[in-house]
């Protein structure tokens, strides 16, 4: 609103950089054939590029990415008992970011 | 995949807490009647609750919220020249979070 500005601080741009985000570990990453299990933990922290660039022709993109394997539990109930196996999920962390030009969409041929 | 676990660290849960997120300041927040302007900055940082809880019946929810007015620029092009006006946008920061029981969906009557 174009209203009273007395107590409003100037807004600071959220610069293009890595920030901590929450990544949900979907069950499909562990087992596509079965839905009767739980993944623990259900979500983990990852580093991801976010923020704004100076104009609409550029976007905040990762320039350096690292894959990080982590061990999760696949928990099933078998004969009333929770049993679990270990599974590995590969997370993607962004290490560095840059405002990069967005390539023009190619015309459909 | 249920594969080689040698280099995989145990996954740590992304706990329910406040994290820094990027909030895009949409033009509709400034002026719903006009689209011929630009907002600067286009995005800002806010504090938001995120993360996972122990089961599906609870969700990470804010228990304390603070409204924070910030001053942005509404930039219009009038007769080829940029005209700056100040506008106030009220941001919502989450100050504290908690895993709270999700109320059962009410039946449609």
């Amino acid at each position: 609103s174009l209203g009273s500005l007395t107590i409003a601080e100037p807004a600071m741009i959220a610069e293009c950089k890595t920030r901590t985000e929450v990544f949900e570990i979907s069950r499909r990453l562990i087992d596509r054939t079965n839905a009767n299990f739980l993944v623990w933990p259900p979500c983990v922290e990852v580093q991801r590029c976010s923020g704004c660039c100076n104009n609409r022709n550029v976007q905040c993109r990762p320039t350096q990415v690292q894959l990080r394997p982590v061990q999760v539990r696949k928990i099933e109930i078998v004969r009333k008992k929770p049993i679990f196996k270990k599974a590995t999920v590969t997370l993607e962390d962004h290490l560095a970011c840059k405002c990069e030009t967005v390539a023009a969409a190619r015309p459909v041929t | 995949s249920l594969g080689s676990l040698t280099i995989a660290e145990p996954a740590m849960i992304a706990e329910c807490k406040t994290r820094t997120e990027v909030f895009e300041i949409s033009r509709r927040l400034i002026d719903r009647t006009n689209a011929n302007f630009l907002v600067w900055p286009p995005c800002v940082e806010v504090q938001r609750c995120s993360g996972c809880c122990n089961n599906r019946n609870v969700q990470c929810r804010p228990t304390q919220v603070q409204l924070r007015p910030v001053q942005v620029r509404k930039i219009e092009i009038v007769r080829k020249k940029p005209i700056f006006k100040k506008a106030t946008v009220t941001l919502e920061d989450h100050l504290a979070c908690k895993c709270e029981t999700v109320a059962a969906a009410r039946p449609v009557t």
């Epitope: 539990r73 928990i75 078998v78 009333k80 008992k81 049993i83 679990f84 | 089961n55």
Partner: antibody, heavy 122, light 110 residues
């Protein structure tokens, strides 16, 4: 408040059959995931699990005692009954019933009765 | 068949000291299961302390903590109170064998 209480004879003769009743309150054995188990403890020795019965009438027994044990429930009376045939002096122990839940996060006895001492002697 | 081996058999400590109790689970299966811990005082029924390896049961003081995974599990009492002197049992289960208890560790006053 969840409570469980065991009842049965304090003394049985060798070769006889022991019948113990667990009467509980504060939960229902018709609730999904709910179970009741029996555990015993000979004097000065460790705990030994005997049997579990579940909300859906599934029953599980200690393999080494399976042919001597029978567990049953009466949901309307909030009772679980354990029978043990061919009693022997080595079966002298305190017998406990306890609540157990089948859950992603747990498979443990969270509430216990005070126990009933059973002596097997002629 | 799953076997739980607790050590030591007896732990002699003074109030205020830290107690570390071990529970070793025999492996041999391609899956893992949770370990729980119970406290038993003379003439009383056992009381659940820890379930799912490291979660404290309702009303249990935070001086009790559980840790471990795979085959080796630990119950730690960070600072022994007079009421903590008791026998402690670990418990786990298998798909076929169902519930198994360890042989117990007695924590006695030194």
């Amino acid at each position: 408040e969840v409570t469980l209480r065991e009842s049965g004879p304090a003394l049985v003769k060798p070769t006889q059959t022991l019948t113990l009743t667990c009467t509980f309150s504060g939960f229902s054995l018709s609730t999904y995931g709910m179970g009741v188990g029996w555990i015993r403890q000979p004097p000065g020795k460790a705990l030994e699990w005997l049997a579990n019965i579940w909300w859906d009438d599934d029953k599980y027994y200690n393999p080494s005692l399976k042919n001597r044990l029978t567990i049953s429930k009466d949901t309307s009376k909030n009772q679980v009954v354990l029978t043990m045939t061919n009693m022997d002096p080595v079966d002298t122990a305190t017998y406990y019933c306890a609540r157990i839940e089948s859950h992603w996060w747990s498979y443990a006895f969270d509430y216990w009765g005070q126990g009933t001492m059973v002596t097997v002697s002629s | 068949e799953i076997v739980l081996t607790q050590s030591p058999g007896t732990l002699s400590l003074s109030p205020g000291e830290r107690a570390t109790l071990s529970c070793e689970r025999s492996s041999g299966s391609n899956y893992d299961t949770y370990v729980s811990w119970y406290q038993q005082k003379p003439g009383q029924a056992p009381r659940l302390l820890i379930y799912a390896d490291d979660l404290r049961a309702s009303g249990i003081p935070d001086r009790f903590s559980g840790s471990g995974s795979g085959t080796d599990f630990t119950l730690t009492i960070s600072r022994l109170e007079p009421e903590d002197f008791a026998v402690y049992y670990c418990q786990s289960y298998g798909i076929e064998t169902d519930i198994v208890f360890g042989g117990g560790t007695k924590v006695e006053i030194k």
